[in-house]
Interface confidence: medium
């Protein structure tokens, strides 16, 4: 039945999320005649591209085509052939490419150029590859989860579609954690958004939303770890770094050149009298937490209140969906349950980090050691970021919902991105007749698409 036109009148869209650590391809599907309704688009496939993020191909751009092949071929199989030509394909690159662009605009452009040439070889309607801003990443994540939760629908339902759904029209805040950046996005309660850079105005389905968003570049879990290592190696007594964020007995040699490769460690860079150092885990949650807190500068705030590094953050309001690495890490640690208090999470993290590395390897034999070794750091980082960075408390912790999927669709920025670029979120409540393009929401950034 593959590649045969389906009797129903459906449409498809493809979005590639080119993240810092990997690329994922998402295929979305919706009934053609209902495309202006809220909650009708759903994800039918996720294909994780084998290999690192696209920014790592800077010295081997000729390999990008092969890298994308498997998942693009998968899309060819899933989407009926008759619809290939009208299926839009978008690629959005996030913080990994933002960092590469900071290092060299020319190198970032070269990577995107090869990506575009590779994707335009497929029979789909390729709409361009671009580096999305941190603000867009936050906004589209917020749109995605609220779209999937039915928050934009004017019809109040008597049932919940997800266990943590509050049956009202209050939107959820969005907490997104990637490898290189993290985003916080929510509607503050009657609070002026004191810094214009963090303010978004939307009109969706006839309702106005004043949304706060910020993307912290270099504060994704992978870059935060690089930052922490660069900070701590400055004061190590030799080329041995006794690190509380890794399990006791864990050892790993790190190249100083790798440590200083990322712009995120520039502020800690110094000439070290060695080219490599060895991490030796000592597995102490409290010390790890303390070390992480040193990455957050809370001494400077030019606003009524800040998150860290002088960035405005209004008082937290309502429920939050925490997704991407917030979810993956907490899911691995078995801490996503609504019933787990913040105190309990901290307790569990203390025990987990203190477990010897040999024991951990045995308990999780199927997990790649590189990932396995970093869960102590990542879990501690998530707690530090949410509690000290964003000022959640033991009480407001109850309002954080660790979400992987909603109604079968991954929580993340890709769905919101596609909904916006395909004009599927109307500014006004849909009438029985289709609306003209002029009434659709336009995010206040201009989108430059390369049509091939």
């Amino acid at each position: 039945t593959q590649n045969k036109a389906l009797p129903e009148n459906v449409k498809y869209g493809i979005v590639l999320d080119a993240g810092s650590s990997h690329t994922s391809l998402y295929i979305y599907k919706w009934p053609a005649e209902k495309e202006n309704d809220t909650g009708v688009v759903h994800q039918v496939e996720e294909c994780r591209v084998k290999g690192p993020g696209i920014s790592k191909f800077v010295q081997k751009v000729n390999e990008i085509g092969i890298y994308l092949t498997d998942c693009m071929e998968r899309a060819r199989e899933v989407i009926p052939r008759s619809q290939h030509q009208e299926t839009p394909v978008y690629l959005g690159a996030t913080a990994g490419m933002r960092l590469l662009r900071m290092e060299s605009e020319e190198l970032a452009d070269r990577v995107l150029d090869v990506v575009e040439r590779s994707l335009s070889n497929y029979p789909f309607d390729f709409q361009g590859a671009r580096i999305i801003t941190g603000q867009e990443e936050g906004a589209y994540g917020w749109i995605t989860i609220n779209y999937l939760l039915g928050k934009f629908s004017q019809k109040t339902r008597w049932f919940s579609i997800v266990p943590y759904e509050t049956n009202n029209q209050e939107t959820f805040g969005a907490l997104d954690l990637g490898g290189a950046s993290t985003q916080v996005t929510f509607v503050p309660q009657n609070q002026t958004i004191e810094s214009p850079d963090n303010a978004l105005q939307f009109r969706l389905y006839g309702k106005d939303y004043n949304v706060y968003t910020h993307s912290f570049l270099c504060y994704g879990k992978d870059q935060a770890l690089w930052q922490k290592l660069a900070k701590d190696i400055q004061v190590a007594s030799n080329e041995i770094l006794r690190d509380p964020c890794f399990h006791p007995g864990y050892k790993k040699v790190v190249n100083v050149s790798d440590l200083y490769k990322t712009p995120c460690t520039k502020r800690f860079e110094m000439t070290l009298p060695f080219q490599q150092f060895e991490i030796q885990g000592i597995g102490n949650y409290q010390q790890c937490h303390q070390s992480i807190l040193e990455l957050f500068n809370t001494s400077y705030c030019p606003y009524s209140q800040c998150a860290f590094n002088g960035i405005f953050l209004p008082p937290l309001q309502g429920d939050f969906g925490a997704f991407s690495a917030f979810y993956f890490v907490m899911k691995f640690l078995n801490l996503t349950s609504e019933k787990v208090s913040q105190e309990k999470v901290t307790e569990m993290m203390k025990k987990f980090c203190a477990q010897p590395w040999e024991e951990i390897k045995t308990s999780y034999a199927g997990v790649k050691e590189k990932y396995l070794s970093e869960y102590c750091f990542s879990g501690t980082y998530i707690l530090s970021l949410l509690l000290q960075g964003y000022h959640f408390t033991a009480d407001s912790w109850e309002h954080i919902h660790f979400i992987g999927k909603i109604q079968g669709s991954d929580a993340g920025w890709t769905l919101g991105y596609m909904l916006n670029l395909t004009n599927m979120i109307p500014a006004e409540q849909p009438l029985s007749t289709p609306l003209s393009h002029s009434t659709y929401v336009a995010h206040h950034h201009h989108h430059h698409h390369h049509h091939h």
Epitope: N238, E239, T271, F274, E278
Partner: antibody, heavy 119, light 107 residues
Framework: QVQLVESGGGVVQPGRSLRLSCAAS????????MHWVRQAPGKGLEWVAY????????YYADTVKGRFTISRDNSKNTLYLQMNSLRAEDTAVYYC????????????WGQGTTVTVSS | DIQMTQSPSSLSASVGDRVTITCRAS??????LNWLQQKPGKAIKRLIY???TLESGVPSRFSGSRSGSDYTLTISSLQPEDFATYYC?????????FGQGTKVEIK
């Protein structure tokens, strides 16, 4: 007090092997990285090799890479230099020295042991 | 590799003289530099570390300074026991490299 005593030097034919030892005392050997440095007759000092405190990191001078191997036994407080495929130009006094940055980089040296490579 | 160019290669001086020895680094060494003293039949002795910090127990007539990529060892008033060979050593990167040495002889 800190003491480093090298041994194992001698006369050896080109192409043959020799193992030098450096016995450490007066400090916590397992905390320190260790170096071998040599000095050819009438010449200056030349760095040879380094090993970190836990043996995880090793560096070699290009002139000895692939022929010399640095190792240590922390339980015996001893540093070693295994020298294979010896050449005439390896003739030198070999010194060991300890290393712990910032304050203790090559701060204590042994008296040296003489290696002569000659047919 | 970082080249350490030491000058002069030898000098003759009298007791009480002020003596200056210079090392120039071919690349940035960020102050990661030792000054060593070698006397025949004795273990090599470190005098100065981190470019200007005096090793404990070393007489205060020895001092180290830095000006850009030039590093200087100064002996303010030469004593009889100071006649020896002096080396600079950079430890900013591997391979560690030494200056060629300066032999200080009695005039």
């Amino acid at each position: 007090q800190v003491q480093l005593v090298e041994s194992g030097g001698g006369v050896v034919q080109p192409g043959r092997s020799l193992r030098l030892s450096c016995a450490a005392s007066g400090f916590t050997f397992s905390d320190y990285g260790m170096h071998w440095v040599r000095q050819a007759p009438g010449k200056g000092l030349e760095w040879v090799a380094y090993i970190s405190s836990g043996s995880s990191i090793m560096y070699y001078a290009d002139t000895v890479k692939g022929r010399f191997t640095i190792s240590r036994d922390n339980s015996k407080n001893t540093l070693y230099l295994q020298m294979n495929s010896l050449r005439a130009e390896d003739t030198a006094v070999y010194y060991c020295a300890r290393d712990l940055y910032y304050d203790h980089v090559l701060d204590y040296w042994g008296q040296g042991t003489t290696v002569t490579v000659s047919s | 590799d970082i080249q350490m160019t030491q000058s002069p290669s030898s000098l003759s001086a009298s007791v009480g003289d002020r003596v200056t020895i210079t090392c120039r680094a071919s690349q940035e060494v960020s102050g990661y530099l030792n000054w060593l003293q070698q006397k025949p039949g004795k273990a090599i002795k470190r005098l100065i570390y981190a470019a200007s910090t005096l090793e404990s127990g070393v007489p205060s007539r020895f001092s180290g300074s830095r000006s850009g990529s030039d590093y200087t060892l100064t002996i303010s008033s030469l004593q009889p026991e100071d006649f020896a060979t002096y080396y600079c050593l950079q430890y900013a990167s591997y391979p560690r490299t030494f200056g060629q040495g300066t032999k200080v002889e009695i005039k």
